[in-house]
């Protein structure tokens, strides 16, 4: 049987992103998200 191995050939980088809550609503403080592969997730 053939052996299959997942290897995308590139690394998926992640980065912490911080936003101000008042930019999207009336709350104060900071919202911290994570960008993985170009997509921001909670």
């Amino acid at each position: 049987d053939a052996e299959f191995r997942h290897d995308s050939g590139y690394e998926v980088h992640h980065q912490k992103l911080v936003f101000f809550a008042e930019d999207v609503g009336s709350n104060k403080g900071a919202i911290i998200g994570l960008m993985v592969g170009g997509v921001v997730i909670a």
């Epitope: 980065q15 101000f20 008042e22 900071a30």
Partner: nanobody, 124 residues
Framework: EVQLLESGGGLVQPGGSLRLSCAAS????????MGWFRQAPGKGREFVAA????????YYADSVKGRFTISRDNSKNTVYLQMNSLRPEDTATYYC?????????????????WGQGTLVTVSS
């Protein structure tokens, strides 16, 4: 866009304090979140602190939390960075920058306008 001019840098002993100012020209100052970044010799530019458009919200890099305070006066189109308990590793050129609302405040690419920088040297 806004034009930014920093001042207040200089030579200070370890444990000392400095207050940086950033004067902005333009009537749209309070449309921008404002941030401070720094760049040590031979290193990349790193985020230090940011303040929201209203001045109500702030955010700090872990390396300066509890020692630095960012604030703004929208009536004077000015943002400040009060730096206390300074350390030799705080030595850098400090840059003021402006970011549009809704962009990530802790990354360099969000900032559309930059000042020329002011040099802070912490040494005995």
């Amino acid at each position: 866009e806004v034009q930014l001019l920093e001042s207040g840098g200089g030579l200070v002993q370890p444990g000392g304090s400095l207050r940086l100012s950033c004067a902005a020209s333009g009537r749209t100052f309070n449309n921008y979140n404002m941030g401070w970044f720094r760049q040590a010799p031979g290193k990349g530019r790193e985020f230090v602190a940011a303040v929201s458009r209203s001045g109500v919200s702030t955010y700090y890099a872990d390396s300066v939390k509890g020692r630095f305070t960012i604030s703004r006066d929208n009536s004077k189109n000015t943002v400040y960075l009060q730096m206390n308990s300074l350390r030799p590793e705080d030595t850098a050129t400090y840059y003021c920058a402006a970011a549009y609302r809704g962009t990530a405040i802790n990354v360099r690419r969000s900032y559309s306008s930059w000042g020329q920088g002011t040099l802070v040297t912490v040494s005995s």
